[in-house]
């Protein structure tokens, strides 16, 4: 079946790299500079990804193989393959509309990126807080004062919350 | 061929919340971002935000925010939009766009009708 | 919010003619730039990405051109089924948007 294949469309051959060329007898053509083929016997390259502005090379473009783009210092990658560069905010704060603000009180940010997150509320799971918290750091719930005596078990800290959803550009 | 097929058209009063689906079928891949954009009679198009199927991080625009939820269910691979507090503004096409750099694949789109 | 600014809003044109459509970037987007094509009750339609790259399936009689704030688009040569509204969009920085629109109608 593959031979026959091969018979019938000549493309079938041309190797990734490479494009099947209707000017020349469909006979097997290097893609042109800035483009590049990822799979053999396609009829045209695709043009290269241009990392520019905020966007900068992560690695470049080969006659096989787009180039990825990454984001320059200061910013970090959204989206697949990198389509988005969002602005990176310190620890305890948040990317507005107007830029990075501080986190309110009762809420923390431990990345450069996402949005304030509520601390953890101890007393729903029957603890007290053994650590406060600050606008970088959630709580650390401790066990419940009625728990506080000799041999009690150690304390063990909240587990990480995933980033929410809903995060400001 | 990639497709999106989003849910019917909605009619709703002011103040209630809509949820509209895109599936997406076809040549889809395991980490890509679907965009919702909406379009009121006679407007240009606006971009509301995306999700990326892989990892569910999703932004909105700083206009809509607070006011809407964009979901993604790996197992249905469709997208979800859920805008809420609505007003006779928010009347317009919703579309759900794939984007691998460019908004490349297109759902139909779904009328939402805002009215008392 | 970077704000894309299309002339004409709309002009007309008869089959055969070269119409050029122009979008301006109230800031520098490189070469982040699409547009679409989008006809009546449809959803757009991706002609060209990063300003002069054609969408597969689009026909040659289209082209982009441009960088930096000021972007052109080009059909060289009208056809029937070209009378439709033209959009830039940039995606440069999010909210990603969108020109204005220019409506080509059948002169």
């Known amino acids: 079946f593959e031979r026959t294949r091969s018979l019938q469309d000549p493309c079938s051959n041309c190797p990734a790299g490479t494009f099947c060329d209707n000017n020349r007898n469909q006979i097997c053509s290097p893609c042109p500079p800035n483009s590049f083929s990822s799979a053999g016997g396609q009829r045209t390259c695709d043009i290269c990804r241009q990392c520019k502005g905020v966007f900068r090379t992560r690695k470049e473009c080969s006659s096989t193989s787009n180039a990825e783009c990454d984001c320059t210092p200061g910013f970090h990658c959204l989206g697949a393959g990198c389509s988005m560069c969002e602005q990176d905010c310190k620890q305890g704060q948040e990317l507005t509309k107007k830029g990075c603000k501080d986190c309110c009180f009762g809420t923390f940010n431990d990345q450069k990126r996402g949005i304030c997150r509520p601390w953890t509320n101890c007393s729903l799971d029957g603890k007290s807080v053994l650590v406060n918290g600050t606008k970088e750091r959630d709580v650390v719930c401790g066990p419940s004062p009625a728990d506080l005596s000799p041999g009690a078990s150690s304390v063990t800290p909240p587990a990480p919350a995933r980033e929410p959803g809903h995060s400001p550009q | 061929q990639v497709q999106l097929v989003q849910s019917g058209a909605e009619e709703k009063t002011p103040g209630a919340s809509v949820k509209i689906s895109c599936k997406a079928s076809g040549n889809t891949f395991n980490n890509y971002d679907i965009h919702w954009v909406r379009q009121a009679p006679g407007e240009r198009p606006e971009w509301m935000g995306w999700?990326?199927?892989?990892?569910?991080?999703?932004r909105n625009s700083q206009k809509f925010q607070g006011r809407v939820t964009i979901t993604w269910d790996t197992s249905a691979s469709t997208a979800y939009m859920e805008l809420s507090s609505l007003t006779s503004e928010d009347t317009g096409v919703y579309f759900c766009?794939?984007?691998?750099?460019?908004?490349?694949?297109w759902g139909q789109g779904t009328l939402v009708t805002v009215s008392s | 919010d970077i704000v894309m600014t299309q002339t004409p809003s709309s002009l007309s044109a008869s089959v055969g003619d070269r119409v050029t459509i122009t979008c301006r970037a109230s800031q520098g987007i490189y070469n982040y730039l699409a547009w679409y094509q989008q006809k009546l009750g449809k959803a757009p339609n991706l002609l060209i990405y990063a300003t002069s790259n054609l969408q597969s399936g689009v026909p040659s009689r289209f082209s982009g051109s441009g960088s930096g704030t000021d972007f052109t688009l080009t059909i060289s040569s009208l056809q029937p089924e070209d009378f439709a509204t033209y959009y830039c969009?940039?995606?440069?920085?999010?909210?990603?948007?969108f020109g204005q629109g220019t409506k080509v109608e059948i002169k």
């Open positions: 766009a794939r984007a691998e750099g460019p908004l490349d694949y």
């Open positions: 999700i990326n199927s892989g990892n569910g991080d999703t």
């Open positions: 969009q940039q995606s440069y920085s999010t909210p990603w948007t």
